[in-house]
């Protein structure tokens, strides 16, 4: 009887099924959808999380899946193909053989095509800009306090190395968090900025992926920081390839 059997859970991913019957009596926590045994000491990849989300019973989903024509607030919900390591495959296709290329955070970066569409490589998203608007407060937050609190959040909650939080900007009521991580900078074991941004996005929406933890309670010097709007912009190492028709629409 081991400690693993006493506490066989996945703190970093509640969309798992855990059992204490792994090798040597260790706990194994398998992601819903893919069935992969995930590392519960760090964040699960966004691809496996999306796959788990799409495998959940429809009535358990709290959000409505937006129309493919939606331009804002599109959750980007689809059942992705993940590679052997649980990352997004460069090419994604739906049930009707419509295909498109995605970046490393699973966001479409080309026009949609058919099965002949080629996506030669998975293009890395190396810069993520998280744009937040907070609810009105008595006064503006102190910029350096806000900066420190958000850096602490990404370091402690999402286990993202501090060097990848490039900047925190603040002009009341807008907060911008810049995450940067080039391919050459990311070492084995480093949390991916795309995964950290996805966990943060779900936290902000009140849909925490962490097991058994309360929701995100962001405070700056004791003052609650309540977000009323979030926009996330993704910049890829290679610019996306959309037709002019889409750009002028």
């Amino acid at each position: 009887h081991t400690a693993a059997q006493d506490n066989c859970t996945c703190p970093t991913n509640k969309m798992t099924v855990c059992s204490p019957d792994g090798p040597g009596g260790r706990c194994q926590c398998r992601a819903l959808g893919s069935g992969m045994a995930v590392d519960c000491s760090t964040l699960t990849s966004k691809c496996l999380l999306l796959k788990a989300r799409m495998s959940a019973p429809k009535n358990a989903r709290t959000l409505v899946r937006p129309s493919e024509h939606a331009l804002v607030d599109n959750d980007g919900l689809y059942d992705p193909d993940c590679d052997p390591e649980g990352r997004f495959k460069a090419r994604q296709c739906n049930q009707t053989s419509v295909c498109w290329c995605v970046n490393s955070v699973g966001v479409r970066r080309t026009d949609k095509g058919d099965l002949s569409l080629r996506c030669d490589e998975l293009v890395r998203t190396h810069h993520i800009l998280i744009d937040l608007r907070h609810r009105p407060t008595a006064g503006a937050f102190n910029h350096s306090d806000l900066d420190a609190e958000l850096r602490r959040l990404f370091r402690e909650r999402y286990r993202l190395h501090p060097k990848f939080v490039a900047a925190v900007h603040y002009e009341q009521p807008t907060i911008q968090i810049e995450l940067r991580q080039n391919t050459s900078q990311k070492a084995a074991g480093d949390v991916d900025i795309g995964d950290a941004a996805y966990y943060f996005e779900r936290d902000i929406k009140g849909e925490s992926l962490f097991q058994g933890r309360g929701g995100l309670d962001l405070r700056v010097r004791g003052e609650p920081l309540q977000v009323e709007r979030t926009l996330i912009y993704y910049l890829d190492e290679i610019p996306p390839k959309f037709s002019m028709k889409r750009l002028t629409a």
Epitope: A3, P23, R26, V38
Partner: nanobody, 120 residues
Framework: QVQLQESGGGLVQPGGSLRLSCAAS????????MSWVRQAPGKGPEWVSY???????YYPDTVKGRFTISRDNAKNTLYLQMNSLKPDDTALYRC??????????????WGQGTQVTVSS
């Protein structure tokens, strides 16, 4: 990029034997723990054997004494010898790059799999 390619599956009668192989590339095979994971129709995945980089092996009770995991580091290949096969062993068998933490069993990557069907 990690690549794992299984082979050796097929149709076999109850009591028969099969040997599965997994060709690995894209990582240091000799320094990695590996496992075989199977998924029967309508069921979740389950590990059926585990081997550390040093050669220590683990098996669940369901296959102990019937399955043997081994590795050839010179060939970057993992093997699973399956004897005394039963209809319950019918499943898709995948090899996985795995590891053990203090408390958890983790699969970092896995292959597409090879189908094993045990039927008379």
């Amino acid at each position: 990029q990690v690549q794992l390619q299984e082979s050796g599956g097929g149709l076999v009668q109850p009591g028969g034997s099969l040997r599965l192989s997994c060709a690995a590339s894209g990582f240091t095979f000799s320094g990695s723990d590996m496992s075989w994971v199977r998924q029967a129709p309508g069921k979740g995945p389950e590990w059926v054997s585990y081997i550390t980089s040093g050669g220590t092996t683990y098996y669940p009770d369901t296959v102990k004494g019937r399955f043997t995991i081994s590795r050839d580091n010179a060939k970057n290949t993992l093997y699973l010898q399956m004897n005394s096969l039963k209809p319950d062993d019918t499943a898709l068998y995948r090899c996985a790059k795995s590891r053990l933490t203090d408390s958890h069993y983790v699969e970092d990557a896995w292959g597409q799999g090879t189908q094993v069907t045990v039927s008379s």
